[in-house]
């Protein structure tokens, strides 16, 4: 069974940011800014054809 | 530090797992200057089909 889409789970550390409780709440400015920067960054990295997008962003303490 | 976890979606056959990781790793320097994000400990794996069918591409 083929969906025509490949999915990859990616995890990484951002060592110059501090985790706090606002990263557990998607309505906070901190959460939304970081999510926007990360989404924009991935569009830059995988700008060649084939990249469909990202989902399920989660932030955890490092 | 902050650990970021996410799912990436690509058209099937357009990229292998090695290049997903390599292209991300090669961008780390630019991420630091452009977004002020110091990235380390990158890990990439493929998502088994049943999970990926549910997750969709955002």
């Amino acid at each position: 069974l083929s969906t025509g889409v490949s999915f990859f789970f990616l995890s990484f550390h951002i060592s110059n940011l501090q985790f706090n409780s606002s990263l557990e709440d998607p309505s906070t400015d901190y959460y939304q800014e970081l999510q926007r920067d990360i989404s924009e960054m991935f569009l830059q990295i995988y700008k060649q054809g084939g990249f469909l997008g990202l989902s399920n962003i989660k932030f955890r303490p490092g | 530090s902050v650990v970021v976890q996410l799912t990436l979606a690509f058209r099937e056959g357009t990229i292998n797992v090695h290049d997903v990781e390599t292209q991300f790793n090669q961008y780390k320097t630019e991420a630091a200057s452009r977004y002020n994000l110091t990235i380390s400990d990158v890990s990439v794996s493929d998502v088994p089909f049943p999970f990926s069918a549910q997750s969709g591409a955002g």
């Epitope: 490949s6 054809g49 | 056959g13 292998n16 797992v17 390599t22 090669q26 493929d46």
Partner: antibody, heavy 120, light 107 residues
Framework: QVQLVQSGAEVKKPGASVKVSCKAS????????MHWVRQAPGQGLEWMGY????????HYNQKFKDRVTITADKSASTAYMELSSLRSEDTAVYYC?????????????WGQGTLVTVSS | DIQMTQSPSSLSASVGDRVTITCRAS??????LVWYQQKPGKSPKLLIY???TLTSGVPSRFSGSGSGTQYTLTISSLQPEDVATYYC?????????FGQGTKLEIK
Amino acid sequence: QVQLVQSGAEVKKPGASVKVSCKASGYTFTTYTMHWVRQAPGQGLEWMGYINPGSDYTHYNQKFKDRVTITADKSASTAYMELSSLRSEDTAVYYCARQGNYAAYYFDYWGQGTLVTVSS
Amino acid sequence: DIQMTQSPSSLSASVGDRVTITCRASGNIHNFLVWYQQKPGKSPKLLIYNAKTLTSGVPSRFSGSGSGTQYTLTISSLQPEDVATYYCQNFWNVPFTFGQGTKLEIK
């Protein structure tokens, strides 16, 4: 037409190093990744590593990581593979092979091969 | 590392026979599977990539199939010029391992 022309056969003593060259022509050298593969006499193919000549990014098979160095000279459209601390088991034909362009996961052109013999 | 296991390691068949070579990966390689043909004393030649896409100039008697961990190269009607060793290759993740090869001979 695309051509990958490799340097000639070499005979080396154990412990020495060898540097094999691969001169590319007929395409833009910096836009295709170049891999190195070896084949011991009567044996199968073994992937050693690659270089992206545009960015100079390299990735090596862990088996060879401490002994192999792959480089590229953009101005000469030439890739090099240097293997150090040679031992008799390194006697093989060494091939350069071009990986197809974006989303092309295969080796579409191969060099003619360079026989490296390690013998005391 | 992903191990690639080819079978059989050698086979002998008659001209006109249908020949099948299989390649098993130790993990899912998501169709990033390549087949090469190598004739004695020559460099390998690309036959099939993405498990089933035939390279331009390769005769249509060659075909590839499979998915996940199991892949097959089929020659529908063996010709004398098909005498060679055939290799599969994992192109999903490094190291980009090859199968040990299948030596094909004519009876």
